[in-house]
C-alpha cells in the first residue's frame, strides 16, 4: 500500500537498518526509497525539546510486516518509502537549505558569486555530493562567498548543524543538469586498477555498470565475467574511484570488462531497472518466500509485487509435476545484490522491476519497428503527438513530443497567430488523423511557453513547451521520449528518423497516416554551405540526403527528429525550417534539443 503523507510527532519503534543525516523529512523519504531495504523511516526535526546532536537524523527502517509500532514523540516525523508506490520517483533535489551546514569531506574550496553558482559547480564536479556556501553576510570575512564542495561515502552528510548565514544543497546530477561527459562504452578485456570502494555480485557488466551509477562513490567499475580464471572472483563487480575521477591505470586482462558510472546519462538510459533474465544462473541471498509459478516471467512479477523482494531464482517444473508450475524463490540481501551467483544448476534468475519506476519512463523499450515503408505502425513512435487548433476549424497544426507526463516539446513557430492555449488540443497515441472524431479524448493546453529569444524559425530558438491541463497516463501507445544528455554532445547519431503527418511534397495536404523517414545527420559546416544566406548556429542541427528526396515538410513542424542510441530513443531535434521540402542539397534544419536541456528543465521543473 502506498502511503505518501508524513506522520508528524510520530516515531516508528524498532526495525533500524542505519542512520543517515538529511536536511528534511522529505529528503529522508527519498533516501529511504533509494536504499535497497528501507521501507519506513523516522526523521528528527530541529526542536528545543530534542538533543541537537539528534537533529536531522534520518533512521532507515525495515520490517517483515511492512509496518512498525508508532510512538508519539515531539519533533519526530515518520513515513514510508515510495517503494510501495507505483508513481515515478526521482532523487532530484533542488532545495536550498538556509542556515544549515551539511558536513562531509571538504575537498574543494573556491569563491562563488552565489549559491546557485556553487550548486552548478557541485553538479559539474565528478566527486561532489553536496555543498555549503557562506553568504556575503557570513560573520567571518575570509569565508564569505566561499563554496565548499563535499562528498561522503554514502552521498548524504555525516552530520548537519545549524549555522547562520550559510546555505547548503545537493548536486543536481540526478536532475540531468550535469555537463559532465556521459561515457556509455564498456571496455572488454580491461581492468581499471584503482581503489575499490565496494564490491557486489552481478550477473553481467551492464548490471555492474548500473549498480556503479547509483552508488554514491562509484565513478567507474571493473567486472569479472563467469569465465574469469580465479573462481572466487567470478561475477564480481568492483566499484571504484580515483582522485582525478578517471582510471589511473588500465590493465589488459581477458574475461574482465570495465566501464564508467552513467551518472551523467541517467536521465536517458535505465540505471535502476535490471530487466533481463539470466538462464542457467542461480542468485543466492536471504530467502523471503518460495512460491509456485508457471514461468520465470510470472516469478519476476511475484518478486516485483513483493515489496521486500530484490531478486529471484526460478527453477522450472520437473516433467508434469505441480501442474507444470516451477518454484519461484523470492530473495533479498543487505545491498540489493545476490550474495553469490552460481551457474550450471538450471535456474533462471532476475531482479525485481519495482526499481524501474526510479528510471525515466522514456528509457522503456518500445516495440520493434517495421523497417522500410513510409507509413508508421501503431505504437512505433509513442511520444509523437498531433497538435490541433480549433481555429478556424479543427485541424492538425503541428507535431510535438511527449517529454513528461504534463509536457509536450514542440516548435515556437507553430504558435504564430495562436491567441490562446485554450483553442489547442493535443492528441496522443494517434496513428491516423481519421481516428480523431468529435468525441476523441484529448489533452487541453494550460500554457504555451515560447523561448523568449525566439523571433523566427530561421534565426533559432524555435522551441516551445506546452503544459497540459491534465497528466498523460503512460501506455504502449503514449509515452515520453528521452531528452539527450548534456554529456552526450559528442555522440554521433546514426539512426535518426523524422516523423509527422505533414505534406509529402510542397503543394500537398496533411497525411492521414503518420509518416516516417530515416534521415542522416549533416554536420553544421556542411549545412552552412547549403544555406549561405542564413546563420546555422550550434543551437541548430541539420539532417537530409545530399540528393534530397526525404525530408520533413509543412505540417511536420514541431515534431521529433528521433535518434536511437544504445537501444534508447532520444529527442535530438525539433522540426523547424528548410528551403522547400526534400530539395537536393537543402537539408532540413532542426532545433538542437541538447542545447536547450537547461531551458527545458528550468521551465518544466519550476515550482
Amino acid at each position: 500500500e502506498c502511503v505518501t503523507q508524513l506522520l508528524k510527532d510520530t516515531c516508528f519503534e524498532g526495525g533500524d537498518i542505519t542512520t543517515v543525516f538529511t536536511p528534511s523529512a522529505k529528503y529522508c523519504q527519498v533516501v529511504c526509497t533509494y536504499h535497497p531495504r528501507c521501507l519506513l523511516f523516522t526523521f528528527t526535526a530541529e526542536s528545543p525539546s530534542e538533543d541537537p546532536t539528534r537533529w536531522f537524523t534520518c533512521v532507515l527502517k525495515d520490517s517483515v510486516t511492512e509496518t512498525l509500532p508508532r510512538v508519539n514523540r515531539t519533533a519526530a516525523i515518520s513515513g514510508y518509502s515510495f517503494k510501495q508506490c507505483s508513481h515515478q520517483i526521482s532523487a532530484c533535489n533542488k532545495d536550498i537549505y538556509v542556515d544549515l551546514d551539511m558536513k562531509g569531506i571538504n575537498y574543494n574550496s573556491s569563491v562563488a558569486k552565489s549559491a546557485q553558482e556553487c550548486q552548478e559547480r557541485c553538479t559539474d564536479d565528478v566527486h561532489c555530493h553536496f555543498f555549503t556556501y557562506a553568504t556575503r553576510q557570513f560573520p567571518s570575512l575570509e569565508h564569505r562567498n566561499i563554496c565548499l564542495l563535499k562528498h561522503t561515502q554514502t552521498g548524504t552528510p555525516t552530520r548537519i548543524t545549524k549555522l547562520d548565514k550559510v546555505v547548503s544543497g545537493f548536486s543536481l546530477k540526478s536532475c540531468a543538469l550535469s555537463n559532465l561527459a556521459c561515457i556509455r562504452d564498456i571496455f572488454p578485456n580491461t581492468v581499471f586498477a584503482d581503489s575499490n570502494i565496494d564490491s557486489v555480485m552481478a550477473p553481467d557488466a551492464f548490471v555492474c555498470g548500473r549498480i556503479c551509477t547509483h552508488h554514491p562513490g562509484c565513478l567507474f567499475f571493473t567486472f569479472f565475467s563467469q569465465e574469469w580464471p580465479k573462481e572466487s572472483q567470478r561475477n564480481l563487480c568492483l566499484l571504484k574511484t580515483s582522485e582525478s575521477g578517471l582510471p589511473s591505470t588500465r590493465i589488459k586482462k581477458s574475461k574482465a570488462l570495465s566501464g564508467f558510472s552513467l551518472q551523467s546519462c541517467r536521465h536517458s538510459i535505465p540505471v535502476f531497472c535490471h530487466s533481463s533474465f539470466y538462464h542457467d544462473t542461480d542468485f543466492l541471498g536471504e530467502e523471503l518466500d518460495i512460491v509456485a509459478a508457471k514461468s520465470h516471467e510470472a516469478c519476476q512479477k511475484l518478486c516485483t509485487n513483493a515489496v521486500r523482494c530484490q531478486f529471484f531464482t526460478y527453477t522450472p517444473a520437473q516433467a508434469s509435476c505441480n501442474e507444470g508450475k516451477g518454484k519461484c524463490y523470492l530473495k533479498l540481501s543487505s545491498n540489493g545484490s545476490p550474495t553469490k551467483i552460481l551457474h550450471g544448476r538450471g535456474g533462471i534468475s532476475g531482479y525485481t522491476l519495482r526499481l524501474c519506476k526510479m528510471d525515466n519512463e522514456c528509457t522503456t523499450k518500445i516495440k520493434p519497428r517495421i523497417v522500410g515503408g513510409t507509413a508508421s505502425v501503431r505504437g512505433e513512435w509513442p511520444w509523437q503527438v498531433t497538435l490541433h487548433t480549433t481555429s478556424p476549424t479543427q485541424r492538425h497544426l503541428c507535431g510535438g513530443s511527449i517529454i513528461g507526463n504534463q509536457w509536450i516539446l514542440t516548435a515556437a513557430h507553430c504558435f504564430y497567430g495562436v491567441e490562446s492555449p485554450k483553442i489547442l488540443r493535443v492528441y496522443s497515441g494517434i496513428l491516423n488523423q481519421s481516428e480523431i472524431k468529435e468525441d476523441t479524448s484529448f489533452f487541453g493546453v494550460q500554457e504555451i511557453i515560447i523561448h523568449d529569444q525566439y523571433k523566427m524559425a530561421e534565426s533559432g530558438y524555435d522551441i516551445a513547451l506546452l503544459k497540459l491541463e491534465t497528466t498523460v497516463n503512460y501506455t504502449d501507445s503514449q509515452r515520453p521520449i528521452c531528452l539527450p544528455s548534456k554529456g552526450d554532445r559528442n555522440v554521433i547519431y546514426t539512426d535518426c528518423w523524422v516523423t509527422g503527418w505533414g505534406y509529402r511534397k510542397l503543394r500537398d495536404k496533411i497525411q492521414n497516416t503518420l509518416q516516417k523517414a530515416k534521415i542522416p545527420l549533416v554536420t553544421n559546416e556542411e549545412c552552412q554551405k547549403r544555406y549561405r544566406g542564413h546563420k546555422i548556429t550550434h543551437k541548430m542541427i541539420c539532417a537530409g540526403y545530399r540528393e534530397g528526396g526525404k525530408d520533413a515538410c509543412k505540417g511536420d513542424s514541431g515534431g521529433p527528429l528521433s535518434c536511437k542510441h544504445n537501444e534508447v530513443w532520444h529527442l535530438v531535434g525539433i522540426t523547424s525550417w528548410g528551403e522547400g521540402c526534400a530539395q537536393r542539397e537543402r537539408p532540413g534544419v532542426y532545433t538542437n534539443v541538447v542545447e536547450y536541456v537547461d531551458w527545458i528543465l528550468e521551465k518544466t521543473q519550476a515550482v
Epitope: T390, S391, P392, T393, Q394, R395, E419, S420, P421, K422, I423, K437, E438, R507, K509, I510
Partner: antibody, heavy 117, light 107 residues
Framework: QVQLVQSGSELKKPGASVKLSCKAS????????MHWVKQAHGQGLEWIGN????????NYDEKFRTRATLTADTSTSTAYMHLSSLTSEDSAVYYC??????????WGQGTSVTVSS | NIVMTQSPSSLSASVGDRVTITCKAS??????VSWFQQKPGQAPKLLIY???NRYTGVPDRFSGSGSATDFTLTISSLQAEDVADYHC?????????FGQGTKLEIK
C-alpha cells in the same frame, strides 16, 4: 440535443446599436467557437466573426471589426453580438452558428434586424 | 481574402435529374469546404463538410468532391424537397467566406 436559440426581431433607428443574443444548450459551450453570419434579404451569407467562449479569443472580418463586438457569458452559455452605428445596410437576418468539429454544424433560427428611420 | 465563386447563381431542373453546383476558390483551400442547404425562411443546414464528407442524416443522393480550388456539390437524383438555396463556404483561413449562393428550382 444541441440547440441555439436567438433573441427576437429588432427594429432600430440609424446610428443606434443593437445587442443580439444566442443561448446554447446540449453541448459544452466553452469548447466550441461561436460564429456570427449575416444574410441580407435575397443575398448570400457573410461572415462577421467568431468567439471562443473559454478564452474570449475573437476574430472579425475587417468590414465589421470597428462596429461588431462579440462576447460570451459562460455562466449562462450565451453568446452576444453588439453592432453599433447602425445603417440601413445592416438590415438583415443574423445567425449564430457553432463551429463543430468539421464545419458550422448547428445554426440558430436567426434574428431579423431592421434599421429604419 | 479568399473569394468563393459559385455557379450557376440559379438553376432549374426536373425531379430525378442529376444536378451539379460548382464552387471555385481564389486560392488553395485544401479540402476545408462545406456545403449548406437553406430553405425559404429557415436557417442554413450543413450538408457536406471537408469537401466530400456527408453530414449525419443527409440523404446519400447528396455528394461533394474536389480539393485545392475546385469543388462540386452533386445531387444524383433531384427530389421535390431539394428546392432551396445552396451555399459553399471555406473555413481554411480567416476571414471565412461563402459563395454567392445557388437558387435551385424544380422545372
Amino acid at each position: 440535443q444541441v440547440q441555439l436559440v436567438q433573441s427576437g426581431s429588432e427594429l432600430k433607428k440609424p446610428g443606434a446599436s443593437v445587442k443580439l443574443s444566442c443561448k446554447a444548450s446540449g453541448y459544452t459551450f466553452t469548447r466550441y467557437w461561436m460564429h456570427w453570419v449575416k444574410q441580407a434579404h435575397g443575398q448570400g451569407l457573410e461572415w462577421i466573426g467568431n468567439i471562443y467562449p473559454d478564452s474570449d479569443s475573437t476574430n472579425y472580418d475587417e468590414k465589421f471589426r470597428t462596429r461588431a463586438t462579440l462576447t460570451a457569458d459562460t455562466s449562462t452559455s450565451t453568446a452576444y453580438m453588439h453592432l453599433s452605428s447602425l445603417t440601413s445596410e445592416d438590415s438583415a437576418v443574423y445567425y449564430c452558428t457553432r463551429m463543430g468539429f468539421y464545419a458550422m454544424d448547428y445554426w440558430g433560427q436567426g434574428t431579423s434586424v431592421t434599421v429604419s428611420s | 481574402n479568399i473569394v468563393m465563386t459559385q455557379s450557376p447563381s440559379s438553376l432549374s431542373a426536373s425531379v430525378g435529374d442529376r444536378v451539379t453546383i460548382t464552387c471555385k476558390a481564389s486560392e488553395n483551400v485544401v479540402t476545408y469546404v462545406s456545403w449548406f442547404q437553406q430553405k425559404p425562411g429557415q436557417a442554413p443546414k450543413l450538408l457536406i463538410y471537408g469537401a466530400s464528407n456527408r453530414y449525419t442524416g443527409v440523404p446519400d443522393r447528396f455528394s461533394g468532391s474536389g480539393s485545392a480550388t475546385d469543388f462540386t456539390l452533386t445531387i444524383s437524383s433531384l427530389q421535390a424537397e431539394d428546392v432551396a438555396d445552396y451555399h459553399c463556404g471555406q473555413s481554411y483561413s480567416y476571414p471565412l467566406t461563402f459563395g454567392q449562393g445557388t437558387k435551385l428550382e424544380i422545372k
